[in-house]
């Protein structure tokens, strides 16, 4: 999960395994102020999961969410 310092959530580790796409509701990018670039996926259980934006599966999921 992202760590929130004040109102800016930042990620210090990424999930290793791809989430099932069906379990992802939405996503957002963490702030440029964070030391690690990250995509945060919000899941069907309203969990926030940090993912590496350089991973192919992450980019594919973002594209698919943008189109839906």
């Amino acid at each position: 999960s992202p760590y929130s310092s004040d109102t800016t959530p930042c990620c210090f580790a990424y999930i290793a395994r791809p989430l099932p796409r069906a379990h992802i509701k939405e996503y957002f990018y963490t702030s440029g102020k964070c030391s690690n670039p990250a995509v945060v996926f919000v899941t069907r259980k309203n969990r926030q999961v940090c993912a590496n934006p350089e991973k192919k599966w992450v980019r594919e999921y973002i594209n698919s969410l943008e189109m839906s």
């Epitope: 290793a16 099932p20 379990h23 899941t43 069907r44 698919s64």
Partner: antibody
Framework: QVQLVQSGAEVKKPGASVKVSCRAS????????IHWVRQAPGKGLEWMGG????????IYAQNFQGRVIMTEDTSTDTAYMELSSLKSEDTAVYYC??????????WGQGTLVTVSS | QSVLTQPASVSGSPGQSITISCTGS?????????VSWYQQHPGKVPKLIIY???ERPSGVSDRFSGSKSANTASLTISGLQAEDEADYYC???????????FGGGTKLTVL
């Protein structure tokens, strides 16, 4: 591309246990979520359980809860499915699979488990 | 008994089109746009032919197409060929305790 290679066929007696292995290559096991699906002779596909990365734990189908254990050895990129208290109805081909229902879906070749006295 | 309901068998002549239905509920097909279809020849591993309701993996013929309306998904095979004779299974993510649910399978016979 992920490749999954399973262990060979097994013959077991009722009441015994069986442990089927599934070795991953192309990706590390820590980057995959392995699921297990079985198919009894002449029957359909049945999901048994698998790793849910959202919760970070293995989840099992109700039908198998208490009788199946799915484990991983990340040092050898091998997943295992152990089914205990075997009955004749457990005679089936057991498949490991990853990215079930997704575009990168990949299946092992299947392992036939025969339960016979 | 399978969670998703498919006809046990369908048949068609070469060149014809056939449709296989797969009926679920509001907690699986009706809840997600993530329905898949598998083709399985006797003694072989199931092969993914449709995912995300309508998408085809690379290498799968465009004679295979998928659709969905409410709680029912459909697989259409056009220009039937002898090699299409196989069992076809639908599957869907589930919002319940079960991660993935499958249909009971449909045997396609090419006459």
């Amino acid at each position: 591309q992920v490749q999954l290679v399973q262990s060979g066929a097994e013959v077991k007696k009722p009441g015994a246990s069986v442990k089927v292995s599934c070795r991953a290559s192309g990706y590390a096991l820590t980057e995959l979520s392995i699921h297990w699906v079985r198919q009894a002779p002449g029957k359909g596909l049945e999901w048994m359980g698998g790793f849910d990365p959202e919760d970070g734990e293995t989840i099992y189908a109700q039908n198998f809860q208490g009788r199946v254990i799915m484990t991983e050895d990340t040092s050898t990129d091998t997943a295992y499915m152990e089914l205990s208290s075997l009955k004749s109805e457990d005679t089936a081909v057991y498949y490991c699979a990853t990215d079930l229902t997704g575009s990168r879906d990949s299946w092992g070749q299947g392992t036939l488990v025969t339960v016979s006295s | 008994q399978s969670v998703l309901t498919q006809p046990a068998s369908v048949s068609g002549s070469p060149g014809q089109s056939i449709t296989i239905s797969c009926t679920g509920s509001r907690s699986d097909i009706g809840y997600y746009n993530y329905v898949s279809w598998y083709q399985q020849h006797p003694g072989k591993v199931p092969k993914l032919i449709i995912y995300d309701v309508t998408e085809r993996p690379s290498g799968v013929s465009d004679r295979f197409s998928g659709s969905k309306s409410a709680n029912t998904a459909s697989l259409t095979i056009s220009g039937l060929q002898a090699e299409d004779e196989a069992d076809y299974y639908c599957s869907s993510f589930s919002s319940g305790d079960t991660f993935v649910v499958f249909g009971g399978g449909t045997k396609l016979t090419v006459l």
